[in-house]
Interface confidence: medium
Amino acid sequence: FERTRSLQDPCSNCPAGTFCDNNRNQICSPCPPNSFSSAGGQRTCDICRQCKGVFRTRKECSSTSNAECDCTPGFHCLGAGCSMCEQDCKQGQELTKKGCKDCCFGTFNDQKRGICRPWTNCSLDGKSVLVNGTKERDVVCGPSPADLSPGASSVTPPAPAREPGHSPQ
């Protein structure tokens, strides 16, 4: 089958890192500098991605694979393959149209990216606030006072029922 296929289409023999050059009788030619082909049988090579400005090179382009970028310090990647670099903020802040702003009371962000999220409402689970929330941290919920047996308040508090939440992007 491979032999039949190659007789019908000589380009199918061209491996990754080459292209089928119509200008040269469909000979397999190496990809020119700053280009690549990641699969065989390609009729053109793709231009390598260039990591410029706020992007920095994480992996150099080769004849068979594209360059990979990440972001310079103070920025983080967004999107597939680090399509964008977005400015970091401090914990306890979120990035708005006007720059980094502190989280409003009742919200928190424990990362340098993402948005401020509301504190957990412990009472919805019939619990009480064990540790107050801050701009940087969610509240920690614990048993409601009614759940504590007499004298329980003098011992080590129970483990939190819920870990501080992580702000999804």
């Epitope: 999107g79 708005t96 990216r113 993402g114 948005i115 702000s167 999804p168 992007q169």
Partner: nanobody
């Protein structure tokens, strides 16, 4: 599991308009993206919007395309005006996971700009 379903693609004449929609199951309290892939080309970034309304666009669509979202309907939109032949592509909506280690994709909707 996040599911993203695009709609609104079709055939339109140069200079025309289309509005794409992306319906998301689950939480879209996150950054949402539009990407596109033209025939024989690599997938490219079009625009994104954050849950607090910040937007960003690729240079090639700035001033012509508008990204928006309706969090109450879990829906992302892309209003495309002054369409050109080079806008012909399959358009995908996408979102990152919380750690930006994975991107979730819809199945895409085809936009063809031709006279």
């Amino acid at each position: 599991q996040v599911q993203l379903v695009e709609s609104g693609g079709g055939l339109v004449q140069p200079g025309g308009s289309l509005r794409l929609s992306c319906s998301a199951s689950g939480d879209i309290f996150s950054i949402m993206f539009w990407y596109r892939q033209a025939p024989g080309k690599q997938r490219e970034y079009v625009a994104h919007i954050t849950s607090n309304g910040r937007t960003n666009y690729a240079d090639s669509v700035t001033g012509r395309f508008t990204i928006s979202r309706d969090n109450s309907k879990n829906t992302l939109y892309l209003q495309m005006n002054s369409l050109r032949a080079e806008d012909t592509a399959v358009y995908y909506c996408a979102r990152d996971d919380a750690t930006n280690t994975r991107t979730y994709w819809g199945q895409g909707t085809l936009v063809t700009v031709s006279s």
